[in-house]
């Protein structure tokens, strides 16, 4: 019961963290700046992984995406690609961990294909959220290290003096999103990984004890078929009697632990 | 590189009009505000009118009622136009455009300017 309640919490989780990397990936708010105080009107800037969008005090607000490629930073791409690649293995994650969920039944799948699979989806779920993390991280600090910190200079160009804009950077909302989803995803991925282990079929802690008779004057001692139950005098699963009846071990050369009475 | 060219500049006589463009172009993702500024000789430089692109207007307190500021967002180009001109609007027009031209990078760029003379 505590398995199933582990890798059901694990899903959830882990599914609640998906959903917040993607939300993430999609907003505009990873960084946010307020352009100076112009006599026209007071500028808002925020920009996403995608567009960057500007809000003047009015209310009016106009979003433009960024159509270039070749022009933008290439921890921008970064940041991309380790969001996507989040978002890829965490939903492959969640498909493989439904099918995996010991509450659904699916044909006669068995416990340890089914260990097989929740492990499979933890390790997606935690590479996921590695990657949301790293990449909210690069992000945040290229705003902390100051790689798109304007400096105030001027030069004077073809069509003029221009002058940089003073702004400073902070963190979005996105960027917190960003965080507790991934640490969410990792998280899950964690619980999944638990749940494998109780999952996983045991070891029997019983040697299975054939008898092959010998002849017609054999006798079997009481208590020679109790070994799986724990009663009687022969709990230890010792040779009973010299006269054929051997353990399982020692008729095949490959035990399995599957081998019974 | 972004730049700013003014235009429409020239002689008019008091009481006459005149029309001021000025196109930006280059690495632009949005220009948020754009606006009109003027320097008259041995004077300080002033606000004419400036303008958003939601439309927010801006004028200074000596060309209210006279002068029309607009703009074509598509275009990035803003328009001035002045009507009813007397002698103390003769200036040096700059067009003061706010670029956002990319990921965190804003500019503040000035144009070089066009003349007007309001003479008889």
């Known amino acids: 019961m505590a398995v199933t309640a582990c890798q059901g919490l694990g899903f959830v989780v882990s599914l609640i963290g998906i959903a917040g990397i993607i939300a993430a990936t999609c907003m505009d708010q990873w960084s946010t700046q307020d352009l100076y105080n112009n006599p026209v009107t007071a500028v808002f800037n925020y920009q996403g992984l995608w567009r960057s969008c500007v809000r003047e005090s009015s209310g009016f607000t106009e979003c433009r995406g960024y159509f270039t490629l070749l022009g933008l930073p290439a921890m921008l791409q970064a940041v991309r690609a380790l969001m996507i690649v989040g978002i890829v293995l965490g939903a492959i994650g969640l498909l493989v961990s439904i099918f995996a969920l010991k509450c659904i039944r699916i044909g006669s799948m068995e416990d340890s294909a089914k260990a097989n699979m929740t492990l499979t989806s933890g390790i997606m779920f935690i590479v996921s959220g590695l990657c949301a993390i790293a990449g909210v991280s690069v992000f945040a600090n290229m705003l902390v290290t100051n790689f798109w910190m304007s400096t105030a200079n001027m030069y004077t160009g073809m069509g003029g003096m221009v002058q940089t804009v003073q702004t400073r950077y902070t963190f979005g909302a996105a960027l917190f999103v960003g965080w507790v989803a991934g640490g969410l995803t990792l998280i899950g991925g964690v619980m999944m990984c638990i749940a494998c282990r109780g999952l996983a079929p045991e070891e029997t802690n019983y040697k299975a004890v054939s008898y092959h008779a010998s002849g017609h004057s054999v006798a079997y001692k009481p208590g020679g078929f109790k070994a799986s139950t724990g009663f009687g005098s022969n709990t230890k699963n010792k040779k009973i009697y010299d006269g054929g009846a051997r353990t399982e071990d020692e008729v095949q050369s490959y035990p399995s632990k599957h081998d019974y009475v | 590189e972004v730049q700013v060219v003014e235009s429409g500049g020239g002689l008019v006589q008091p009481g006459g009009s005149l029309r001021l463009s000025c196109a930006a172009s280059?690495?632009?993702?949005?220009?948020?505000?754009m606006s009109w500024y003027r320097q008259a000789p041995g004077k300080q430089r002033e606000l004419v009118a400036g303008?958003?692109?939601?439309?927010?207007?801006n004028y200074g307190d000596s060309v209210k009622g006279r002068f029309t500021i607009s703009r074509d967002n598509a275009k990035n180009t803003v328009y001035l136009q002045m009507n009813s001109l007397k002698p103390e609007d003769t200036a040096a027009y700059y067009c003061?455009?706010?670029?956002?031209?990319?990921?965190?990078?804003?500019?503040?760029?000035w144009g070089q300017g066009t003349l007007v003379t309001v003479s008889s």
């Open positions: 280059g690495s632009i993702l949005h220009i948020p505000v």
């Open positions: 003061n455009v706010l670029v956002v031209s990319g990921i965190g990078s804003h500019l503040e760029v």
């Open positions: 303008i958003s692109t939601g439309g927010t207007t």
